[in-house]
Interface confidence: low
């Protein structure tokens, strides 16, 4: 009789596999397995220029885990082409879509350009590509748009060669000329599109009330209603300037609270290049412009200009050592210009204006001097107009402009004054131009 044996039962437990995942278009899956069971996982990686999306929302990464019931814990994401979005506007310029109308996705190309004649592109060539990281990027790797910088030193006037003893300016002759009204009439010269270069003494009295400065650009007639109004955001007076103790370091910058629109009547003056001294040697001709006192002893109605030669520095120093002028007035930070015979000079009311020279290589005008001081009688024979020597202050100018920003904030609030001050009480016997 056969012996009885019990049932042998084998229990085997197989985890429920999850549906086989398929990588989305423009994506790949890792790791690839024959099947995926409980606790197995996979990740999805998108090709360069594509981003992971769950529904409509971007993901940093994606990993799905196979659950006990054989379902994935997350739905499959998609790999969507990166969209850099509309490129930033370019002030004083424009953007053109190269790839196609308003195409802003990965590898799309745009071209920035600046308004012709009055602006030039800085930083790069203006060509930007939508990169995989979602940023419009230039060939040099910059993510911020280029800058349209105003072209400086353009003038309708061809060089003189031969405003006191001067001539009437025509529209566009001195588009950098700025009229500053406040305590008294003064002048300045536009730098870039939101800075004014002037003399420290011209705005010293208003240094703590800069917002009261009435700044006018594009004017030809002093009293004309046709001008562009600007206001000061901040005033920077050279820390080495001491009021009423001579005119050394007689230089100041005014930051405007808004950028001005550049056109044929409003254009900045260039700052001197390193090579500029070769155009400012003794007897080279500079041009001063302003609405200061004329030969008739009145402020000029029309903007006037005068072509005057640079005077040898020693000759100028000697001229101001004679009585009634005390020694040491003319420093290495000054240059002199005028005719030995007199008759052509800048004068009171021209203070702060630019003495400009033509750079024969670039054919652009640059500021070589700032109208500072001179003899009691403008245009006096044997005396000369004294100008702040701008080339000595290029590091100071550039430092302030880079530290305090190229762009006007456009914001409200009162204008501020910035400087280091050491006040000395000392009589002076030169006249302020």
């Amino acid at each position: 009789m056969a012996s009885m044996t019990g049932w042998k039962i084998h229990y085997t437990s197989t985890a429920q596999p999850c549906p086989y995942p398929m990588a989305p278009p423009n994506g790949h899956l890792s790791p690839v397995q024959a099947k995926y069971i409980l606790k197995d996982s996979f990740s999805i990686f998108c090709e360069p220029g594509y981003e992971l999306l769950q529904g409509h929302l971007p993901l940093k990464s994606f990993a799905a885990v196979c659950q006990k019931d054989g379902s994935w814990d997350q739905p499959m994401p998609s790999c969507s082409i990166v969209d850099c979005g509309p490129p930033d506007d370019l002030p004083s310029g424009r953007v053109e879509y190269i790839t196609g109308p308003e195409v802003t996705t990965y590898k799309a190309v745009i071209q920035y350009s600046c308004e012709e004649t009055f602006y030039t592109m800085k930083v790069n060539d203006g060509k930007y590509v939508c990169e995989a990281d979602g940023f419009w990027t230039s060939s040099k790797g910059e993510r911020s748009p280029p800058v349209c910088e105003p072209v400086c030193g353009l003038s309708a006037r061809t060089t003189g060669g031969r405003i006191y003893g001067g001539q009437k300016a025509k529209p566009g002759d001195f588009p950098w000329q700025v009229l500053i009204l406040g305590g008294s009439t003064a002048a300045g010269a536009l730098l870039y599109d939101n800075w004014v270069l002037t003399a420290a003494h011209a705005i010293y009295e208003q240094k703590h009330d800069a917002s009261s400065l009435d700044i006018r650009l594009g004017a030809l007639k002093r009293l004309s209603p046709h001008y562009t109004q600007a206001w000061a955001e901040a005033v920077f007076i050279h820390e080495g300037y001491t009021h009423d103790a001579g005119f050394d370091n007689d230089i100041a910058l005014i930051k405007l609270n808004n950028k001005v629109v550049i056109n044929s009547n409003i254009t900045p003056i260039c700052l001197p290049r390193k090579e500029a001294e070769s155009f400012m040697r003794t007897d080279d001709i500079g041009t001063a412009s302003g609405w200061g006192l004329t030969q008739r002893g009145l402020l000029a109605r029309n903007l006037m200009y005068v072509d005057i030669p640079i005077v040898d520095h020693q000759k100028c120093t000697a001229a101001y050592e004679k009585p009634p002028y005390s020694g040491g007035s003319v420093t290495a930070n000054m240059l002199c210009a005028g005719l030995e015979s007199g008759g052509k000079d800048s004068c009171r009311g021209d203070s702060g204006g630019a003495l400009v020279f033509l750079d024969n290589e670039t054919q652009r005008w640059f500021v070589g001097g700032i109208v500072s001081w001179g003899s009691m009688n403008c245009g006096e024979a044997g005396q000369y107009g004294v100008y702040t020597k701008v080339i000595n202050y290029i590091p100071w100018i550039k430092n302030i402009i880079s530290n305090f920003g190229g762009g006007g904030s456009g914001g409200g609030g009162s204008a501020k004054f910035v400087a280091a001050w050491t006040l000395k009480a000392a009589a002076h016997h030169h006249h302020h131009h």
Partner: antibody
Framework: EVQLVESGGGLVQPGGSLRLSCAAS????????MAWVRQAPGKGLEWVAT????????YYRDSVKGRFTISRDNAKNSLYLQMNSLRAEDTAVYYC??????????????????WGQGTLVTVSS | EIVLTQSPATLSLSPGERATLSCRAS??????IHWYQQKPGQAPRLLIK???RSISGIPARFSGSGSGTDFTLTISSLEPEDFAVYYC?????????FGQGTKLEIK
Amino acid sequence: EVQLVESGGGLVQPGGSLRLSCAASGFTFNDYNMAWVRQAPGKGLEWVATILFDGSRTYYRDSVKGRFTISRDNAKNSLYLQMNSLRAEDTAVYYCSTESPYYSEGYYQGYFDYWGQGTLVTVSS
Amino acid sequence: EIVLTQSPATLSLSPGERATLSCRASQSVSTSIHWYQQKPGQAPRLLIKYASRSISGIPARFSGSGSGTDFTLTISSLEPEDFAVYYCQQSYSSLYTFGQGTKLEIK
């Protein structure tokens, strides 16, 4: 103080159109995704649409797709909802809201942190 | 779409009592649940985000917990101003949905 003020609601016939506006203040508008959420009288809340901070993408619930358009003007700190082909079931108070994005466990999700007081839209003949 | 079911529909309690409101999701939503309070004639107000994260300016008596499909909003000691309708919302799915609400009323 964050403020969202809706306007533009009113009575409109079925098939008609309405444009809602939301004026935002007290925060950096162009940093926020914005949304419209509605609430039918005596009922619960229902998300309608979202627009990303820069206006580059818009999202809608299925029942309003093709009929409603969400848009924004960052220069004016304003959000809009253009509603066309209105139906009776669109009757609701429409709220404008900031939608704060947040990364959580690998994906981007939103919740509604600031709300306006709402504007009533009634679709009836 | 992910359906959120809140319970109870109405909860009657007295000031000083502890309130426990429930929100259940039709599928796992991880911790992507947010709670709002709405009083009659007013807009909703965010109370809790991501299941348990507190919101600045919201009293400490409001707390949240839960993960996956089951979530709870707890009010430790009811104040008279807490009687209102409470909604949960999920952001796990890109089609955001809200629960139907729980009305908390004074007993």
